[in-house]
């Protein structure tokens, strides 16, 4: 807490400018009007304040807005955002995507901090769902964002937003997350033709049920082994040797290298040896 002291004569700030960097902490507290600071927040980032000085400016804003900052101030926080705690951010009501982008830019290149996580949570909850523009923005800053959400949080993603998802955004999603995302992707891409559909749906197939894999096996899709290895074991087990052969196409030879790993290992054990022998790969059930 900065002690309340009278502002020295002639030092009262008329505007937020570079002269303020020479003010001591107590002078900033005494001489900068909080309302002036709030209206000229956009200037703060152009001025090389020390961390200690930024603490004073934050304190002034906290006093002016004890219930939480208005969005007009939040949008121009810049590096002052790094001084905010998750508790501060929970008081905010951020509705503009531009505000979100401005604050994410401040944290760019760093891991997602608790502050950023809280900001995103507030923003998404305020919107009611994770729309395409928001998802575009978040995955641009944090490619792993989608897979950081719980399965329940993912359930609020509308199918239309799935178009914003790139394969790398799903790299760390687990089977339960893909269980939630796959039906949305299926719905989003349903009007595409066979080969285009497979290119789009491929990253989501870790959530696909057996009947969809059977259908894909009839479409000459040539699934690669990396995708096959991410399929749900319970979805792969009922597939016949012929269906797996059609599903993988020329990649079927890769089964030999993966025969000790799930789901290939479990699938092999479910097949008749005569059927496995038709592949000519020396797989032993």
């Amino acid at each position: 807490e900065v002690e309340k002291t009278a502002c020295p004569s002639g030092k009262k700030a008329r505007e937020i400018d570079e002269s303020l960097i020479f003010y001591k902490k107590w002078e900033l507290e005494a001489c900068v009007d909080a309302a002036l600071l709030a209206t000229q927040m956009d200037r703060v980032n152009a001025i090389p304040f020390t961390y200690e000085q930024l603490d004073v400016l934050k304190h002034k804003l906290d006093e002016l807005y004890p219930q939480g900052y208005p969005e007009s101030v939040i949008q121009h926080l810049g590096y002052l955002f790094l001084k905010m705690s998750p508790e501060d951010i929970r008081k905010w009501n951020v509705t503009s995507l531009e505000t979100l982008k401005a604050l994410l830019e401040v944290n760019k290149g760093h891991e997602m901090s608790p502050q950023v996580a809280t900001l995103i949570d507030r923003f998404v909850k305020g919107r009611g769902q994770l729309d395409k523009d928001t998802l575009d923005t978040l995955t641009a800053f944090y490619p792993g964002y989608l897979c950081s959400l719980s399965p329940e949080e993912l359930s609020s993603v509308p199918p239309s937003s799935i178009w914003a998802v790139r394969p790398q955004d799903l790299d760390t999603c687990d089977p339960r997350q893909l269980d939630v995302l796959y039906p949305k992707a299926r719905l989003a891409f349903q009007n595409m033709n066979g080969s285009e559909y497979f290119v789009k749906i491929q990253s989501f197939l870790g959530g696909a049920p057996t009947e969809d894999l059977k259908a894909l096996s009839q479409q000459n899709v040539s699934m690669d082994l990396a995708t096959f290895m991410k399929l749900r074991t319970d979805a792969v087990l009922p597939l016949t040797v012929a269906e797996v052969q059609k599903l993988l196409g020329p990649h079927v030879e890769g089964l030999k290298a993966e025969e000790r790993h799930r789901p290939v290992r479990d699938w092999i054990l479910r097949q008749r040896q005569d059927d496995l022998d038709t592949l000519g790969l020396g797989l032993q059930g």
Partner: antibody, heavy 116, light 112 residues
Framework: EVQLQQSGPGLVAPSQSLSITCTVS????????VHWVRQPPGKGLEWLGM???????DYNSALKSRLSISKDNSKSQVFLKMNSLQTDDTAMYYC??????????WGAGTTVTVSS | DIVMTQSPSSLAVSAGEKVTMSCKSS????????????LAWYQQKPGQSPKLLIY???TRESGVPDRFTGSGSGTDFTLTISSVQAEDLAVYYC????????FGGGTKLEIK
């Protein structure tokens, strides 16, 4: 405060069905999953099934034919219905909250005794 | 289904002692893409419902005393209580949530 409160019959006759209600407060059923878990006297925990925030359900494969889970978001209630009860279904039945992974809050449980 | 096996089934220790209990899964609950272990620990005191202690194998639930520590990866996990208190008398369950949801048989902790 987040709470899950359970109500049920206590005593059920063999071959009859069981209905338990889990009434939640402090969170929205559209944003969380609710699971059902049971515990026979002096034994461990057995997962029965769950209902996602969006309304889809998953069941324990061994009990699937006898179980039904539903909910009413507006009343903040989740319902477990289990058919054809036998004496080995005697247990404490719990509802628990989840975000799709582990269970962070549990109800106090409902004792169900199957006996004639 | 993934089968969870806990050992010992029961143990008795004096207050202030360190205790460890084991949980083994029939297949790995480590998901390679995100390097997370889909394992939780619960404490169930007599006459009460289970309470979450640890999730993601080692993350302590808020409000849980720091004497409780979860460790391990893949198929072998351990719950450690660094200095047992009288109020830790309970049954401890491990729980995997990678593929469906299954629990271990529990370890009963008694205080001498």
């Amino acid at each position: 405060e987040v709470q899950l409160q359970q109500s049920g019959p206590g005593l059920v006759a063999p071959s009859q069905s069981l209905s338990i209600t889990c009434t939640v407060s402090g969170f929205s059923l559209s944003r969380y999953s609710v699971h059902w878990v049971r515990q026979p006297p002096g034994k461990g925990l057995e997962w029965l099934g769950m209902i996602w925030g969006g309304g889809n359900t998953d069941y324990n494969s061994a009990l699937k034919s006898r179980l039904s889970i539903s909910k009413d978001n507006s009343k903040s209630q989740v319902f477990l219905k289990m058919n054809s009860l036998q004496t080995d279904d005697t247990a404490m039945y719990y509802c628990a909250r989840s975000l799709g992974w582990y269970f962070d809050i549990w109800g106090a449980g409902t004792t169900v005794t199957v006996s004639s | 289904d993934i089968v969870m096996t806990q050992s010992p089934s029961s143990l008795a220790v004096s207050a202030g002692e360190k205790v460890t209990m084991s949980c083994k899964s029939s297949q790995s609950v480590l998901y390679s893409s995100n390097q997370k272990n889909y394992l939780a620990w619960y404490q169930q005191k007599p006459g009460q419902s289970p309470k979450l202690l640890i999730y993601w194998a080692s993350t302590r639930e808020s409000g849980v005393p720091d004497r409780f520590t979860g460790s391990g990866s893949g198929t072998d996990f351990t719950l450690t209580i660094s200095s047992v208190q009288a109020e830790d008398l309970a049954v401890y369950y491990c729980h995997q949530y990678l593929s469906s949801w299954t629990f271990g048989g529990g370890t009963k902790l008694e205080i001498k």
